[in-house]
Interface confidence: medium
């Protein structure tokens, strides 16, 4: 494959490119003569003969772990050795479309696809994941239960950076004015727990009420915030005197 053996370039003898062109752009063979499609992440490269390929910008050809045979050809990159294209920068990046890409190479590939559809190119805005305001993954659910019961509300939120989650009790006053009381306050029958997860940049929070009293009835708000914004969701706790007062939806039992 040494380019010292390159003869005159005869484009007519070059293999044709795909009819729709190369998704990751064109490169040339070792002699700088025949056009070839640049290979993408995970695609074969190196090797010899028809299998020879070059990686797209931002990638490099590294030895494939899959094949161990043919060590004799290794020094010359001969047919016995194959490589695979890997991204040089193997960290997530944030695209101008607001999407987080696992690598700069995947962002470039997405940009090429966008341009091939006549859309705007996607550029790298920053290293690392794109920042995003919080959103509620799983909101708390309304609860009906009797005095003395143990109940809990849960709320799952996501955002980048990871949001801070707090719980408020919403108090509606006269003329529709509402105010919130940050929980747990001074209540000794109420506990709040928060933990990261289940996914990256997610937080799950719980309000545990035990024992439930009439004063605990009302609307509870799960509020998440980070540098990019805030989100909230709420649920009601209704305290009844007897279990038969709890409405049962079709196919569901009451949350006890």
């Amino acid at each position: 494959s040494s380019s010292d053996t390159c003869g005159p370039c005869e484009p007519a003898s070059c293999p044709p490119l795909p009819p729709l062109g190369c998704l990751l752009g064109e490169t040339r063979d070792a002699c700088g003569c025949c056009p070839m499609c640049a290979r993408g992440e995970g695609e074969p490269c190196g090797g010899g003969g028809a299998g020879r390929g070059y990686c797209a910008p931002g990638m490099e050809c590294v030895k494939s772990r899959k094949r161990r045979k043919g060590k004799a050809g290794a020094a010359a990159g001969g047919p016995g050795v194959s490589g695979v294209c890997v991204c040089k920068s193997r960290y997530p990046v944030c695209g101008s479309d607001g999407t987080t890409y696992p690598s700069g190479c995947q962002l470039r590939a997405a940009s090429q696809r966008a341009e091939s559809r006549g859309e705007k190119a996607i550029t790298q805005v920053s290293k690392g994941t794109c920042e995003q305001g919080p959103s509620i993954v799983t909101p708390p659910k309304d609860i009906w239960n009797v005095t003395g019961a143990q109940v809990y509300l849960s709320c799952e939120v996501i955002g980048i950076p990871t949001p801070v989650l707090i719980w408020n009790k919403v108090k509606r006053g006269h003329y529709g004015v509402q105010r919130t009381e940050l929980l747990p306050g001074d209540r000794d029958n109420l506990a709040i727990q928060t933990r990261g997860g289940p996914e990256k940049h997610e937080v799950t929070g719980w309000v545990l009420v035990s024992p439930l009293s009439k004063e605990d009835a009302g609307e509870y708000e799960c509020h998440a915030s980070n540098s990019q914004g805030q989100a909230s969701a709420s649920a009601k706790i209704t305290v009844v005197d007897a279990l038969h007062e709890i409405p049962v939806k079709k196919g569901e039992g009451a949350e006890l």
Partner: nanobody
Framework: VQLQESGGGLVQAGGSLRLSCAAS???????YLWYRQPPGKQREFVAA???????NYADSVKGRFTISRDNAKKTVYLQMNSLKPEDTAVYVC???????????????WGQGTQVTVSS
């Protein structure tokens, strides 16, 4: 492996520019190539020169552009004469080199230098 292009700029139609691309790093270079990416278009091949001296040009630049290399300096040059407005593009240098022990040629790319030809 790092590539640094220079020599781009604004020039009147019919004028000349000389681009250069210097490579740094320890590796064996097989082929130097120049590509260009006109605004809103795909990257396209311009010229190539191999270590053995084989030279190849895109039809659109034949007779106007000349590629040359200085092996000692690990530098490639693109002399561009009789420039036309359609030559306006980001010119990107590319080398095919194998710095790895198993002898694969890797493509290495520069960041590009802007050439603008006004009419």
């Amino acid at each position: 492996v790092q590539l640094q292009e220079s020599g781009g700029g604004l020039v009147q139609a019919g004028g000349s520019l000389r681009l250069s691309c210097a490579a740094s790093g320890t590796f064996s270079i097989n082929t130097y190539l120049w590509y260009r990416q006109p605004p809103g278009k795909q990257r396209e091949f311009v010229a190539a020169i191999t270590s053995g001296g084989s030279i190849n040009y895109a039809d659109s630049v034949k007779g106007r552009f000349t590629i040359s290399r200085d092996n000692a300096k690990k530098t490639v040059y693109l002399q561009m004469n009789s420039l036309k407005p359609e030559d306006t593009a980001v010119y990107v240098c590319n080398i095919k080199a194998h710095p790895n022990p198993w002898g694969f040629d890797n493509d290495y790319w520069g960041q590009g230098t802007q050439v603008t030809v006004s009419s």
